[in-house]
């Protein structure tokens, strides 16, 4: 509950406000209750963090967040007698971290990371303006199913790009999702200042490309089933089929947000398949479909990344140009 | 075969604004930085801003901050120099160069003039 | 800024001799230097990065070597096509910056 009753007098500051880091970007927070409590006053602690972000009113005497240490980040902690957001708390005590020392200009940009198909991570940076062309680099990266940090050993460059990339496969745990990877890339010198990100695990996903199956014709209607990238359930998926007809030059894109196998002409009961009519097209011509997926936002934050085209297939005749 | 092509120089008063394109060819566009570089007769070969390869991070010299803006099109593989605030001493041929691995430029368009004169 | 100095600004040569061009830096650059050649009305051409390693397509008679604030651009033996201006540039630092230029000229 609310505790006993709330004195008027101003509680005394809590002591010993102390911060450390776990991992590679979990901050806490840890403190010691007021000296001189009120003894019929029980204990609340108001939080929050520089910004006046995130306020908070709780029992306990830690806090921790999860935030890229790119820069100086502080959590101010005052005691109370009650849950009350308009009770004065005591004096604000304030502790702060800073990122790890070094030249912001030699720090990597653009850290970021995509998750492949639910299989693998691949982060990619691009070397700060004030940084020695020759400078190695190491990621290392966290996971809450992982029992220590780990260092990223497939490193590669791509044009002015670095990156690297590790295996990160979906577990069974429901709440596996829920957590967000750890990032942080340094060089092996220990010259450039340190880069951080954080990368929940319903953003930034691509699916691998699906796999045409059939591909079949019912009056001038085509009928496209496919196969989803494993990993993913249809549902969770948005579609792009897209077909190209040779006479006429035809391109037609079909956004598809649903795409089930109900109807009669589709092979039925075959796992993980998806399903599409394209109306009005000539079977009496050669027509070539490919088809993209990405996730979709019942399942994921994010649904910005397509996959890449799945293998053409055709159907029909290529007429004889005369 | 790498290829640069620069364009959009011409005469303009001062205060006035004018904006450069560059379109490049022969190679992965995305992956890498693409700047502009001036020259002038009296104070030579001079760097004036740049854009990684996805545009998100931009650099400038000082000489032009605040009145320079770059961006970059990967669909169209161009990039465009917007300058505002023209003065007297922005009057320079401007290439537009592809970066190398790192800050040196391997790849040159042919040049723009831009001309600031009332 | 990074400052590099060049010398000398101008030289006159003839065809077949070595030319050698000195490149010196306002702090030790590593080995981050490029050289280019420039043509009249023409755009620079790359030649020579990390001090020493040749552009694709470069003649074998361009070499560099240095380190730190010495560098040196040889011609080992002068070609007809090769009378243009030479810069030098650090990229050690941002931002990256040029050699005032050498003139190289016909005896």
């Known amino acids: 509950g609310g505790g006993g009753a709330a004195p008027t007098e101003t509680q005394p500051p809590v002591t010993n406000l102390s911060v450390s880091v776990e991992n590679l970007c979990t901050v806490i927070w840890t403190w010691n209750p007021p000296e001189g409590a009120s003894s019929n006053c029980s204990l609340w602690y108001f939080s929050h963090f520089g910004d006046k972000q995130d306020k908070k009113i709780a029992p306990e005497t830690r806090r921790s967040i999860e935030v890229p240490l790119n820069e100086r980040i502080c959590l101010q902690v005052g005691s109370q007698c009650s849950t009350n957001e308009s009770e004065k708390p005591s004096i604000l005590v304030e502790k702060c971290i800073s990122p790890p020392e070094g030249d912001p200009e030699s720090a990597v940009t653009e850290l970021q990371c995509i998750w492949h198909n639910l299989s693998y991570m691949k982060c990619s940076w691009l070397p700060g303006r004030n940084t020695s062309p020759d400078t190695n680099y190491t990621l290392y990266y966290w996971h809450r199913s992982l029992e220590k940090i780990h260092q990223c050993e497939n490193i590669f460059r791509e044009g002015q790009y670095f990156g690297c990339s590790f295996d990160l496969t979906k577990v069974k745990d429901s709440s596996f999702e829920q957590h967000s990877v750890q990032i942080m890339v340094k060089d092996n010198a220990g010259k450039i200042k340190p880069s951080f990100n954080i990368v929940p695990l319903t953003s930034r996903v691509k699916p691998d490309p699906p796999h045409i199956k059939n591909l079949s014709f019912h009056n001038d209607d085509l009928y496209v089933q496919w196969e989803n990238p494993q990993n993913f359930i249809s549902r969770c998926l948005f579609y792009e089929v897209e077909v190209n007809n040779s006479q006429t030059e035809t391109h037609n894109v079909f956004y598809v947000q649903e795409a089930k196998c109900e109807n009669p002409e589709f092979e039925r009961n075959v796992e993980n398949t998806s399903c599409f009519m394209v109306p009005g097209v000539l079977p009496d011509t050669l027509n070539t479909v490919r088809i993209r997926v990405k996730t979709n936002k019942l399942c994921y934050e994010d649904d910005k990344l397509w996959s890449n085209w799945s293998q053409e297939m055709s159907i029909g005749k290529k007429r004889n140009s005369t | 075969e790498v290829q640069v092509l620069d364009s959009g120089g011409g005469l303009v008063q001062p205060g006035g604004s004018l904006r450069l394109s560059c379109t490049a060819s022969?190679?992965?566009?995305?992956?890498?930085?693409m700047s502009w570089v001036r020259q002038t007769p009296g104070r030579g070969l001079e760097w004036v801003s740049g854009i990684s390869g996805s545009g998100l991070s931009t650099y400038f010299a000082d000489s032009v901050k605040g009145r320079f803006t770059i961006s970059r099109d990967n669909s169209k593989n161009t990039v465009y120099l917007q300058m505002n605030s023209l003065r007297a001493e922005d009057t320079a041929v401007y290439y537009c160069a592809k970066e190398g691995d790192w800050i040196y430029f391997d790849s040159w368009g042919q040049g723009t003039l831009v001309i600031v004169s009332s | 800024d990074i400052q590099m100095t060049q010398s000398p600004s101008s030289l006159s040569a003839s065809v077949g001799d070595r030319v050698t061009i000195t490149c010196r830096a306002s702090?030790?650059?590593?080995?981050?230097l490029a050289w280019y050649q420039q043509k009249p009305e023409k755009a620079p051409k790359s030649l020579i990065y990390a001090a020493s390693s040749l552009q694709s397509g470069v003649p074998s008679r361009f070499s560099g070597s240095g380190s730190g604030t010495d560098f040196t651009l040889t011609i080992s033996s002068l070609q007809p096509e090769d009378f243009a201006t030479y810069y030098c540039?650090?990229?050690?630092?941002?931002?990256?910056?040029f050699g005032q230029g050498t003139k190289l000229e016909i005896k």
């Open positions: 022969g190679f992965t566009f995305r992956l890498y930085t």
């Open positions: 702090q030790g650059i590593s080995s981050w």
């Open positions: 540039q650090q990229y050690n630092s941002h931002p990256p910056t």
